[in-house]
């Protein structure tokens, strides 16, 4: 009897032995199943971000060609109203030109003297930008960049006045401390009469004979 | 590619007449003002005339006023530069470019060369 029972024990615990070997084989299985299947999901997961990502890209980049075409075609047909029309009206901005508030604006690549600068603008039925307020003056910034660049705005003729007739006096100023100078040392002969945004915005007067680049400004009519 | 392509110059009497041209490619030349320029020996470059687009406005420098004419052929893609009454001052390379341009868009010029 007692011989019988050792017998089943040994069994016993043998197949307990086994059962737990097994188990752990099992449990070790599914848990490299479990990491595998874990590394797979987040594969899956990072596939699938990137791609959300991706698309949301798409997206947008295909919005904002879609929002150029609509100004484009919008630009071309008021371009062909004005062609057809007498050209007295202008209701939108001529190709390349950048329009704000009501006016259109072009900037130039290359540099010449203010007075060239000038003729230039007037040939494009315009004038050298005159500049009436902050939010104008940033936005110029804004397409300029750092550089040098011509305005409407000169002394040549005595006091400081704008191209366009806009009173200097009482309107929007922004000249470097201690400008305008008319400073004489440069060396080129006379003053400087001819006033240009510096590489950080603020106005300074120079010799207007000098190269620099312009921007050209024109109003826009109402449209009827 | 933009290719601006002056013909006309050569040797001239002062008093003389010439009639320069100048022949585009590479762009929509109806969609530019264009001008002359000019650079005589050992100066700098200088502006002679400009004309708007539809060639209603044109500009001159003093120094040419009631002597040259600037004309334009959109039909053609063709720039012209009428020069009367020449003068020695008036020998220099003469180009055509699009207004407003950089450099790289300026022809090779012909020269003009006021000389009895």
């Known amino acids: 009897q007692n011989s019988q029972l050792r017998e089943d024990l040994l069994a016993l615990r043998q197949n307990f032995s086994n059962l737990t070997v097994s188990t752990e084989d099992q449990v070790k299985a599914l848990s490299t199943q479990g990491s595998s299947v874990g590394r797979k999901m987040k594969l899956v997961e990072s596939k699938l971000e990137k791609q959300q990502k991706d698309l949301t890209e798409d997206h947008s980049s295909l919005l904002l060609h879609v929002k150029q075409l609509v100004s484009d075609v919008r630009s071309l047909s008021c371009q062909m109203a004005a062609f057809r029309g007498n050209g007295s009206e202008r209701t939108c901005c001529p190709i390349n030109w950048v329009e704000y508030e009501g006016s259109c604006y072009w900037f130039s690549s290359s540099v010449r003297p203010w007075t060239e600068a000038d003729k230039y603008c007037q040939l494009e039925n315009a004038h050298l930008v005159v500049v009436t307020s902050r939010d104008e003056q940033n936005f110029l910034q804004r397409h300029m960049g750092p550089l040098n660049t011509w305005i409407g705005l000169t002394d040549q003729n005595g006091p400081w006045k704008w191209v366009d007739g806009t009173d200097y006096e009482t309107g929007f100023q922004n000249w470097r401390p201690e400008q305008p100078d008319n400073w004489y040392g440069h060396g080129l002969g006379g003053g400087e009469d001819c006033a240009h945004f510096t590489t950080d915005g603020r106005w300074n007067d120079d010799v207007c004979r000098r190269p620099y680049r312009w921007v050209c400004e024109t109003k826009l009519d109402k449209a009827n | 590619e933009v290719q601006l392509l002056e013909s006309g110059g050569g040797l001239v009497q002062p008093g003389g007449s010439l009639r320069l041209s100048c022949a585009a490619s590479g762009f929509t030349f109806a969609d530019y003002p264009m001008e002359w320029a000019r650079q005589a020996p050992g100066k700098g470059l200088e502006w002679v005339s400009g004309i708007s687009r539809d060639g209603s406005r044109t500009y001159y420098a003093d120094s040419v006023k009631g002597r040259f004419t600037i004309s334009r052929d959109n039909s053609k893609n063709t720039l012209y530069l009428q020069m009367n009454s020449l003068r020695a001052e008036d020998t220099a390379v003469y180009y055509c470019?699009?207004?407003?341009?950089?450099?790289?868009?300026w022809g090779q010029g012909t020269l003009v060369t006021v000389s009895s």
């Open positions: 470019a699009k207004m407003g341009s950089n450099f790289d868009y």
